[in-house]
């Protein structure tokens, strides 16, 4: 395996300046998959630096990335999706640093969308629904979703609920009355595929009603 030290004790000799991370997105454009890589250090001078992936590909040995500003990107149908690929940073045809990566372990789902909240007066609850493009996909179909909500005035007090469906009920009694809430959702692979959280969906804002006292009850 070219560019590799023969043993673990030499692996850290690779140039740390060029450390990078990548994520894959499966069926991101019809049946096309994508792979996005970027340097961890935003100050790396990327002039003349190229990325290449070799191994675990269909019909070809290697593929070169396109450069888009500071990220490197491939869109292709040629990922085998089984076995490890070797992703290398190259300059003038010479590898500076490489990583062996299984593309099924670095999957980043697409962000959920169409988040909305409907108040049900009779039930005294809020029904949260959202959509995900992954319901239509053939590979990464099973996701875990993280719904986060907070009272708008509590900047860092996010409450989180994990769920596998795209519908959640929040009980009115667990929320502050007459308050403005912000809610958002993100997703992560949850069956066979592994990887990263998606970007957050756009936030949705909703207001809780005032407490409706029953007849005969007095305000405190």
């Amino acid at each position: 395996e070219s560019g590799y030290a023969q043993n673990g004790d030499l692996e850290d000799a690779e140039l740390d300046d060029y450390s990078f991370s990548c994520y894959s997105q499966l069926e991101v454009n019809g049946s096309q998959h994508s792979l996005t890589c970027a340097f961890e250090d935003p100050d790396v001078n990327t002039t003349n630096l190229e990325f290449e992936i070799c191994g675990a590909l269909v019909e070809v040995k290697c593929l070169s990335f396109r450069k888009l500003q500071e990220i490197y990107f491939i869109e292709t149908k040629k990922f085998l999706l089984i076995g490890k690929s070797n992703i290398c940073v190259k300059v003038g045809g010479k590898s500076l640093t490489c990583k062996k990566i299984d593309l099924t372990t670095i999957v980043k789902p697409e962000a959920p969308f169409d988040l909305s909240v409907i108040y049900r007066e009779g039930a005294n609850d809020f029904v949260v629904t959202f959509n995900t493009s992954h319901l239509q996909k053939k590979y990464v179909k099973v996701l875990m979703h993280d719904v986060a909500y907070r009272q708008e005035k509590d900047e860092n007090k996010w409450m989180h609920v994990n769920l596998s469906s795209t519908k959640l009920t929040l009980l009115q009694r667990n929320l502050q009355p007459e308050a403005m809430y912000e809610i958002k959702v993100r997703s992560i692979p949850d069956h066979y595929f592994k990887g990263f959280w998606s970007e957050w969906s756009p936030s949705y804002y909703f207001r809780t009603p005032e407490i409706n006292n029953s007849p005969g009850e007095m305000d405190p």
């Epitope: 673990g8 089984i82 299984d102 372990t105």
Partner: antibody, heavy 118, light 111 residues
Framework: QVQLVQSGAEVKKPGASVKVSCKAS????????LHWVKQAPGQGLEWIGG????????AYNQKFKGRVTMTSDRSTSTVYMELSSLRSEDTAVYYC???????????WGQGTTVTVSS | DIVLTQSPASLAVSPGQRATITCRTS??????????MHWYQQKPGQPPKLLIY???NLESGVPARFSGSGSGTDFTLTINPVEAEDTANYYC?????????FGGGTKVEIK
């Protein structure tokens, strides 16, 4: 060339522990997970668990959980499997195997025979 | 656990003929076109050797007379034409779900 070399045969008494080693060479040690597979005499193959030498993260077959511990030493490119509370059913050849992908085994050690007998 | 059932348990084939081994799983081991089924050959006194990964991908260095096919719950390993050196036990293995399980094995003998 890529090689996995395992430690020698062991004879143990019931209730004892055994620690088997597997030394990797010919590739970058942290690039591939290493797994252990059991083969009892005249029987088929049984996955015990695996370790990621990069992170030290482990995954164990529930059947062996609590009795098996896998560790790795990056300085010597070696992984270890320790099996405790040995019983006669643990008599087997134990193989270490490199995971070429999730989770198939493209390189195998020569095997270590463990005999449990009173 | 996913149970893998291999058939036949043993098989005697003449050199130059075709040998077919099947492996049936208790639940699907495929995700769309990703088939998480693998095949190994084991000769007496030796460790197993990977032949096929992902149902149909030939491991580097393995002769082209070995081929694999199948999806979902039904998979096949074919040796065509069989050679004398192919006398061995053959195992299938799934990797969709932990614990990663193997079939019981098929013993292939050359007549």
């Amino acid at each position: 060339q890529v090689q996995l070399v395992q430690s020698g045969a062991e004879v143990k008494k019931p209730g004892a522990s055994v620690k088997v080693s597997c030394k990797a060479s010919g590739y970058r040690f942290t690039d591939y997970e290493l797994h252990w597979v059991k083969q009892a005499p005249g029987q088929g193959l049984e996955w015990i668990g695996g370790i990621d030498p990069k992170t030290g993260g482990t995954a164990y077959n529930q059947k062996f959980k609590g009795r098996v511990t896998m560790t790795s030493d990056r300085s010597t490119s070696t992984v270890y499997m320790e099996l405790s509370s040995l019983r006669s059913e643990d008599t087997a050849v134990y193989y270490c195997a490199r995971s070429g992908g999730r989770w198939y085994f493209d390189v195998w050690g020569q095997g270590t025979t463990v005999t449990v007998s009173s | 656990d996913i149970v893998l059932t291999q058939s036949p348990a043993s098989l005697a084939v003449s050199p130059g003929q075709r040998a077919t081994i099947t492996c049936r799983t208790s639940e699907s081991v495929s995700i769309h076109l990703l088939h998480l089924m693998h095949w190994y050959q084991q000769k007496p006194g030796q460790p197993p050797k990977l032949l096929i990964y992902g149902a149909s991908n030939l491991e580097s260095g393995v002769p082209a007379r070995f081929s694999g096919s199948g999806s979902g719950t039904d998979f096949t390993l074919t040796i065509n034409p069989v050679e004398a050196e192919d006398t061995a036990n053959y195992y299938c293995q799934q990797s969709i779900k932990d614990p990663y399980t193997f079939g019981g094995g098929t013993k292939v003998e050359i007549k």
